[in-house]
Amino acid sequence: QGGTRSPRCDCAGDFHKKIGLFCCRGCPAGHYLKAPCTEPCGNSTCLVCPQDTFLAWENHHNSECARCQACDEQASQVALENCSAVADTRCGCKPGWFVECQVSQCVSSSPFYCQPCLDCGALHRHTRLLCSRRDTDCGTCLPGFYEHGDGCVSCPTSTLGSCPERCAAVCGWRQMF
């Protein structure tokens, strides 16, 4: 092996591994093993992953690339990053939607579906936390609305008779006009 910079070929390091008869240099990310090297410490024959396949790491034994995942349209998923020879498709949710994991112990590879984010404005509430990794967190009712049951109800414009206690506390000032 030429120059002193070459990684030592001892079959034990990260650079060379025994493939077939010899210790061979692995294939770079985005390439698969077509044929192992034909001499000690030689380069394997590596080919670029075909379209719609990938290999993310340097490898010594992968004789085929992994198929790129397709984002699940049924689960409203979209491709945030298209597949390349070195990285799988990154699926996620479009703006205004959030990831709802389908398993309790949620990790990056867990199955998920996309849910539309709550529109706090439509619910007449303040937006406390914007929707991204989880649903929007809505806060208190907007001015001119009061809490009633699970929702926000518009302050009445006429008599106090139709205004319960919570309404009166929030909307009482309206009666002075």
Epitope: D10, I19, L21, E39, P40
Partner: antibody, heavy 123, light 111 residues
Framework: EVQLVQSGGGLVKPGGSLRLSCAAS????????MSWVRQAPGKGLEWLST????????YFPDSVKDRFIISRDNAKNSLYLQMNSLRVEDTGVYYC????????????????WGQGTLVTVSS | DIVMTQSPDSLAVSLGERATINCRAS??????????MQWYQQKPGQPPKLLIY???NVESGVPDRFSGSGSGTDFTLTISSLQAEDVAVYYC?????????FGQGTKLEIK
């Protein structure tokens, strides 16, 4: 005692197929790479194929690549050479051989050989 | 491919005399300080027999009249005192890289 006993040779027409076998005994077969070498009548030795131990990768010269298939059955201590699309020039004595690895430099030498089996390709 | 060329093609030597066979590789067969080449003996009607490996190491069971030398591209097989049973064809072979290649053979006879 290391022994390699060959079988499967014979007369075959051009374009035909033949499967050679090599039964090994006297050593741990699965731990050795194995090879086939042939010798045309009155000629020298020609390396034909090697199959590695463990992962069973196979190697061929261009002259037989895509026509010959080497395989092994470690459970049966046997080595095989499947020869397809045979040509007149494939005629010769075929030997199986054990490849012994020497030292830590990935260096192989054929230290035991079978008795040879004659393959004749003729119309 | 590495081409192995032997000389001479045939050789006649008297019993008890020294026999020398040469082998030249078209490129170096050296790797990590070892010459990846070997010598085989083939008697009529028999398979080849390994005599020398790594250019100069005598295989177990081979008589010590056989020796090998050389490095890089030039190698020599020497039989120090020829015996009748040494009549055979001798082949050099490289294992430096695939395809493995043999020399064309040297036929050794008694003069």
């Amino acid at each position: 005692e290391v022994q390699l006993v060959q079988s499967g040779g014979g007369l075959v027409k051009p374009g035909g197929s033949l499967r050679l076998s090599c039964a090994a005994s006297g050593f741990k077969f699965s731990s050795y790479a194995m090879s086939w070498v042939r010798q045309a009548p009155g000629k020298g030795l020609e390396w034909l194929s090697t199959i590695s131990d463990g992962d069973s990768y196979s190697y061929f010269p261009d002259s037989v690549k895509d026509r010959f298939i080497i395989s092994r059955d470690n459970a049966k201590n046997s080595l095989y050479l499947q020869m397809n699309s045979l040509r007149v020039e494939d005629t010769g004595v075929y030997y199986c051989a054990r490849d012994r690895i020497y030292g830590s430099v990935q260096y192989y030498a054929m230290d035991y050989w079978g008795q040879g089996t004659l393959v004749t390709v003729s119309s | 491919d590495i081409v192995m060329t032997q000389s001479p093609d045939s050789l006649a030597v008297s019993l008890g005399e020294r026999a020398t066979i040469n082998c030249r590789a078209s490129e170096s067969v050296e790797f990590s300080g070892t010459s990846l080449m070997q010598w085989y003996q083939q008697k009529p009607g028999q398979p080849p027999k390994l005599l020398i490996y790594a250019a100069s190491n005598v295989e177990s069971g081979v008589p010590d009249r056989f020796s090998g030398s050389g490095s890089g591209t030039d190698f020599t097989l020497t039989i120090s005192s020829l015996q009748a049973e040494d009549v055979a064809v001798y082949y050099c072979q490289q294992s430096r890289k695939l395809p493995y290649t043999f020399g064309q053979g040297t036929k050794l006879e008694i003069k």
